[in-house]
């Protein structure tokens, strides 16, 4: 099964401070961050489509989620599957197409005021704090009204960047996804060679802020390809 591939037990670089500078070499950490397969289904045509193996939703496209292709099938074999549209069954938010979220086991529109709220108990992913299952049962708890209308602050658990407040993006931090600051000018950024490759990172940086792009630092042009430092620079 794919689980046997989950053996990448070292994190080569420690993360930079939130929204900050580059990491430093660090000691190995026991981790199984996901499967680093080359390519992805982003550039595969329909007539040449091959299922893209995955371990995390982030490894799939924005209109996909990671799951076993057959219900009750081998839990170890997971591939990127097309997201579920409104009124389709779901088990977690990532299964629903953008603009929807999983409520009571059904994908529903997120165009409701309370969806944007940072939920009590520092939750931004649970949206209404429902206990959602495929069976569709729900145990609602009362939310304080002051929590509605506010988006996730720095460090809040999130699903997508739209869950985070202005100036923040939703990025992976080891086994969780949290709101992190969008990068400022001069800060180190990650240049993705391939669309979608950001999902493979254990520690994910945000993108560069408005008017900035992630480009190789001028004084690093002579460095080897692998050690080139990218920073957020003005267009």
């Amino acid at each position: 099964t794919l689980n046997s591939v989950l053996n990448s037990n070292a994190i080569k670089n420690l993360p930079p401070p939130l929204g900050g500078a580059a990491g430093h070499p660090g000691s190995a950490v026991s981790a199984a961050p996901g499967i680093l397969y080359p390519g992805g289904n982003k550039y595969q045509t329909i007539d040449n489509y091959q299922p893209y193996p995955c371990a995390e939703d982030e490894e799939c496209g924005t209109d996909e989620y990671c799951a076993s292709p057959t219900r009750g099938g081998d839990a170890g074999v997971q591939i990127c599957l097309a997201c579920r549209k409104r009124r389709k069954r779901c088990m977690r938010h990532a299964m629903c197409c953008p603009g929807n979220y999983c409520k009571n086991g059904i994908c529903v529109s997120s165009d409701q005021n309370h969806f944007r709220g940072e939920i009590e108990e520092t939750i931004t992913e649970s949206f209404g704090n429902d206990h959602s299952t495929l069976d569709g049962y729900s145990r609602r708890t009362t939310l304080s009204s002051k929590m509605y209308h506010t988006k996730g602050q720095e460090g809040s658990v999130c699903l997508r960047s739209s869950d985070c407040a202005s100036g923040l993006c939703c990025a992976r931090h080891f086994w969780s996804k949290i709101c992190k600051p969008v990068l400022k000018e001069g800060q180190v950024c990650t240049k993705h060679r391939r669309k979608g490759s950001h999902g493979l990172e254990i520690f994910q940086r945000c993108y560069c802020g408005e008017g900035l792009s992630c480009r190789i630092q001028k004084d690093h042009h002579q460095a080897s390809n692998s050690s080139r430092l990218h920073t957020c620079q003005r267009h």
């Epitope: 900050g20 108990e121 649970s126 206990h131 699903l159 086994w175 969780s176």
Partner: antibody, heavy 118, light 107 residues
Framework: EVQLLESGGGLVQPGGSLRLSCAAS????????MSWVRQAPGKGLEWVSA????????YYADSVKGRFTISRDNSKNTLYLQMNSLRAEDAAVYYC???????????WGQGTLVTVSS | DIQMTQSPSSLSASVGDRVTITCRAS??????LNWYQQKPGKAPKLLIY???ALQTGVPSRFSGSGSGTDFTLTISSLQPEDFATYYC?????????FGGGTKVEIK
């Protein structure tokens, strides 16, 4: 209300195995990363392992790497910790905890006691 | 691994006292610092996350500050129910590590 309830602890001989379970309710379990944290009698807290919401990524403390396996069944809202080759130093109260903001442990179970003794 | 050093390891105080506990990380952890309260025989309870954010339901007499390597938990006016052990924890880089704890006892 978020609730986490651990079970499966008990007395086991050195070299033996145990499987701990943590039943979760009151929140959308599949959306949250979860961890196991332990506390030896009279000692401080020690993080043991963590798993992402989908179960695709697992992390371990060096002290348990290769012996413990964290897993989850999102259809059952349950977190597991399979503990093999148990040692005396593994004896502790084991808590399951949910990952909240800044990867803090925002909700904890009541704990289950694991005793390793011959 | 990142070492978390808490001080003092224990302190005696009276109801109404202002209590300060410090936590130092062996390297910068940005604001990935959380504080917990634990009473005997009970599970820990989250007080402060992200160095300074008060967890929902926690009394406002608890506050946290700091960034980088040095952090502080302050109880502005100690109440009878605050006598417990307090732990800091870094969540910046695995393995997540806790401080040794500070036991707050009645004077």
């Amino acid at each position: 209300e978020v609730q986490l309830l651990e079970s499966g602890g008990g007395l086991v001989q050195p070299g033996g195995s145990l499987r701990l379970s943590c039943a979760a309710s009151g929140f959308t379990f599949a959306n949250y990363a979860m961890s196991w944290v332990r506390q030896a009698p009279g000692k401080g807290l020690e993080w043991v392992s963590a798993i992402s919401g989908s179960g695709g990524s697992a992390y371990y403390a060096d002290s348990v790497k290769g012996r413990f396996t964290i897993s989850r069944d999102n259809s059952k809202n349950t977190l597991y910790l399979q503990m093999n080759s148990l040692r005396a130093e593994d004896a502790a109260v084991y808590y399951c905890a949910r990952s909240g903001s800044f990867l803090s442990f925002d909700s904890w179970g009541q704990g289950t006691l694991v005793t390793v003794s011959s | 691994d990142i070492q978390m050093t808490q001080s003092p390891s224990s302190l005696s105080a009276s109801v109404g006292d202002r209590v300060t506990i410090t936590c130092r990380a062996s390297q910068s952890i940005s604001r990935f610092l959380n504080w917990y309260q634990q009473k005997p025989g009970k599970a820990p309870k989250l007080l402060i996350y992200g160095a300074s954010a008060l967890q929902t339901g926690v009394p406002s007499r608890f506050s946290g500050s700091g960034s980088g390597t040095d952090f502080t938990l302050t109880i502005s006016s100690l109440q009878p129910e605050d006598f417990a052990t307090y732990y800091c924890q870094q969540s910046y880089i695995p393995p997540l590590t806790f401080g040794g704890g500070t036991k707050v006892e009645i004077k």
